[in-house]
């Protein structure tokens, strides 16, 4: 084993190229200079190294940068990123959105790994807040990203970033998350006209208080049942039959199909039977 630590004559790597795929692991260790590897990281992805060979290359970078890789190297890691542990990534200082995109691209199509979660956390903390461009990027790769954040983390999202949010990005958000996001959405969209405003705010209404639902009921919005079913129960309960009828418009007929589910069930139980009868849906309080 001892003699294998020296690089065989004529095998010293002058550049990172395809010839290295024929090197044994110990030859890569002995014959590839770490500084050369760092300056030519962009070439590594074009070369079909085995996982074992990539382990050696990572080891060389770890030795060269024990405090964490510089961003110039991180941006070109490519598939070597998949070899990184969350502990490795916590040492990084990633500030460029291009670097983030490059690494997310490597993991594209897969579930969010602990490595990616750590990378995103480092990036967002470095920026100080979840700005619009970052949110755009993250939700493009992971539509459920926003709903993976705690209400506390969402508190740092500036209202301007809300423009980047698509309805599907909120599909898995719970009421506590919408609690925080809804006021931001109200600030972001308030200068839009009535119908456009409703289209934008609709996905966030799971965080709306009763008073806002009452206000919406006066605006002929025709809320669909799917949206109504996601409203906070405590916000729906004080609404009158007339207000719910105005809020839902032609969709009010859908209440019958949902009469056993919250918040419709609880709302029905709060209404006078005479009022429910005015809907003509056979709802029983």
């Amino acid at each position: 084993e001892v003699e294998k630590t020296a690089c065989p004559s004529g095998k010293k790597a002058r550049e990172i190229d395809e010839s290295l795929i024929f090197y044994k692991k110990w030859e890569l260790e002995a014959c590839v200079d770490a500084a050369l590897l760092a300056t030519q990281m962009d070439r590594v992805n074009a070369i079909p190294f085995t996982y074992e060979q990539l382990d050696v290359l990572k080891h060389k970078l770890d030795e060269l940068y024990p405090q964490g890789y510089p961003e110039s190297v991180i941006q070109h890691l490519g598939y070597l990123f998949l070899k990184m542990s969350p502990e490795d990534i916590r040492k990084w200082n990633v500030t460029s959105l291009e670097t983030l995109k490059a690494l997310l691209e490597v993991n594209k199509g897969h579930e969010m790994s602990p490595q990616v979660a750590t990378l995103i956390d480092r990036f967002v903390k470095g920026r100080g807040q979840l700005d619009k461009d970052t949110l755009d990027t993250l939700t493009a790769f992971y539509p459920g990203y926003l709903c993976s954040l705690s209400p506390e983390e969402l508190s740092s999202v500036p209202p301007s970033s809300i423009w980047a949010v698509r309805p599907q990005d909120l599909d898995t958000c719970d009421p506590r998350q919408l609690d925080v996001l809804y006021p931001k959405a109200r600030l972001a969209f308030q200068n839009m006209n009535g119908s456009e405003y409703f289209v934008k705010i609709q996905s966030f209404l799971g965080g709306a208080p009763t008073e806002d639902l009452k206000a919406l009921s006066q605006q002929n919005v025709s809320m669909d049942l799917a949206t109504f079913m996601k409203l906070r129960t405590d916000a729906v309960l004080p609404l009158t039959v007339a207000e719910v009828q105005k809020l839902l418009g032609p969709h009010v007929e859908g209440l019958k199909a949902e009469e056993r589910h919250r918040p419709v069930r609880d709302w029905i139980l709060r209404q006078r039977q005479d009022d429910l009868d005015t809907l003509g849906l056979g709802l029983q309080g």
């Epitope: 209400p151 209202p159 009421p175 506590r176 609690d179 925080v180 809804y182 006021p183 109200r186 600030l187 308030q190 965080g207 208080p209 008073e211 806002d212 009452k214 206000a215 906070r232 405590d234």
Partner: nanobody, 121 residues
């Protein structure tokens, strides 16, 4: 148009509890989506401390959670912050903040002018 005004002692001893009150004028505190506190240590960026939402849910910065208590008194149009076991690292300008407009067509986020709290013996 809401006006927010922070009040409380400007000097607190280490290990004691910092208590601040935010008095709201120009409108009812009940029409707010949330009531919150933010601070800015000297030479550093803003740090969110916590918020109480209209729904009744309260959220605190995880790094401060064990030491923070926030409450709202709608009858006095005030909300308050208590931060226990303070150290010199808690020296900062403290701002109260609120977003009104519940049930209205427009909404606005308001901040107090800030109050400097120094932790020193």
């Amino acid at each position: 148009q809401l006006q927010l005004q922070e009040s409380g002692p400007g000097l607190v001893k280490p290990s004691e509890t910092l208590s601040l009150t935010c008095t709201v004028s120009g409108g009812s505190i009940s029409n707010s989506y949330y009531w919150g506190w933010i601070r800015q240590p000297p030479g550093k960026g803003l740090e969110w401390i916590g918020s109480i939402y209209h729904s009744g849910n309260t959220y605190y910065n995880p790094s401060l959670k064990s030491r923070v208590t926030m409450s709202v008194d709608t009858s006095k149009n005030q909300f308050s912050l208590k931060l226990s076991s303070v150290t010199a690292a808690d020296t900062a300008v403290y701002y109260c903040t609120s977003q009104d407009g519940v049930g209205a067509t427009t909404t606005e986020e308001y901040w107090g002018q800030g109050t400097l709290v120094t932790v020193s013996s």
